[in-house]
């Protein structure tokens, strides 16, 4: 519950409450913005981001974006509100506890993105097909 001595701020998304007024704690995510990466042709990679941040808003989730073009590979790690698009894409997998990369269509580059909602879940990014959430058994595991 928000205690009575804490002001309730009208229409402020810094306070997320359930129907009973309980306060949601924010997520912890890797947050290094865009960094050069050596992650390539692997089933999974660690972010190598040394900064874990408290997300600004409790509804935000962890996001990772892997991009490869002719010149370099980058990995972006941030917090983001799943109600809002990121890089023009909806965060479809925001409820997942793991950051399972999905390829997105971007001209001139290879572009993968994942989102997830457990602490520091964007530290381990997964490309492997065996984690594909089209597998109904995995969906059961994720949402149980």
């Amino acid at each position: 519950t928000i205690p009575p001595h804490v002001q309730k701020s009208v229409n402020n998304d810094m306070i997320v409450t359930d129907n009973n007024g309980a306060v949601k704690f924010p997520q912890l995510c890797k947050f290094c913005d865009v960094r050069f990466s050596t992650c390539d042709n692997q089933k999974s990679c660690m972010s190598n981001c040394s900064i874990t941040s408290i997300c600004e808003k409790p509804q935000e989730v962890c996001v990772a974006v892997w991009r490869k073009n002719d010149e370099n590979i980058t990995l972006e790690t941030v917090c983001h509100d799943p109600k809002l698009p990121y890089h023009d894409f909806i965060l479809e997998d925001a409820a997942s506890p793991k950051c399972i990369m999905k390829e997105k269509k971007k001209p001139g580059e290879t572009f993968f993105m994942c989102s997830c909602s457990s602490d520091e879940c964007n530290d381990n990014i997964i490309f492997s097909e065996e984690y594909n959430t089209s597998n109904p058994d995995l969906l059961l595991v994720i949402f149980q």
């Epitope: 519950t1 009575p4 359930d18 009973n20 309980a22 306060v23 949601k24 704690f25 912890l28 408290i54």
Partner: nanobody
Framework: EVQLLESGGGLVQPGGSLRLSCTAS???????RMWWVRQAPGKGLEWVS?????????YYANSVRGRFTISRDNSKNTLYLQMNSLRAEDTAVYYC?????????????????WGQGTQVTVSS
């Protein structure tokens, strides 16, 4: 009775320092994550810093990283926030709050998961 009691707030000039304390009683301090949360006038809650119950791993909001340091003394059931290089935008009421690890919501409907707050004003 569960209690969280903050102290150490006050008026300080920009660039100055303050050390906040939060003394806990009535529960097993070492079982809880502890947070510092602040609220500026007319604004929402801002989650400033977190410390784990064991191992003392710490986390910060981007807005305070490098200026604030959270710590805890489990033998004294006390949480601290050392605030350096204070800015006008740090002006707020600072609360300590406790969280059971793995629980994303504060317990409901009790409000004993929060202290009463201590006012920090940064002004010249």
């Amino acid at each position: 009775e569960v209690q969280l009691l903050e102290s150490g707030g006050g008026l300080v000039q920009p660039g100055g320092s303050l050390r906040l304390s939060c003394t806990a009683s009535g529960f097993t301090f070492t079982e809880y994550r502890m947070w510092w949360v602040r609220q500026a006038p007319g604004k929402g809650l801002e989650w400033v810093s977190l410390i784990e119950p064991i191992g003392n791993r710490t986390y910060y909001a981007n807005s305070v990283r490098g200026r604030f340091t959270i710590s805890r003394d489990n033998s004294k059931n006390t949480l601290y926030l050392q605030m350096n290089s204070l800015r006008a935008e740090d002006t707020a009421v600072y609360y300590c709050a406790k969280q059971i690890p793995g629980h994303m919501w504060t317990a409901n409907p009790r409000s004993d998961y929060w202290g009463q707050g201590t006012q920090v004003t940064v002004s010249s």
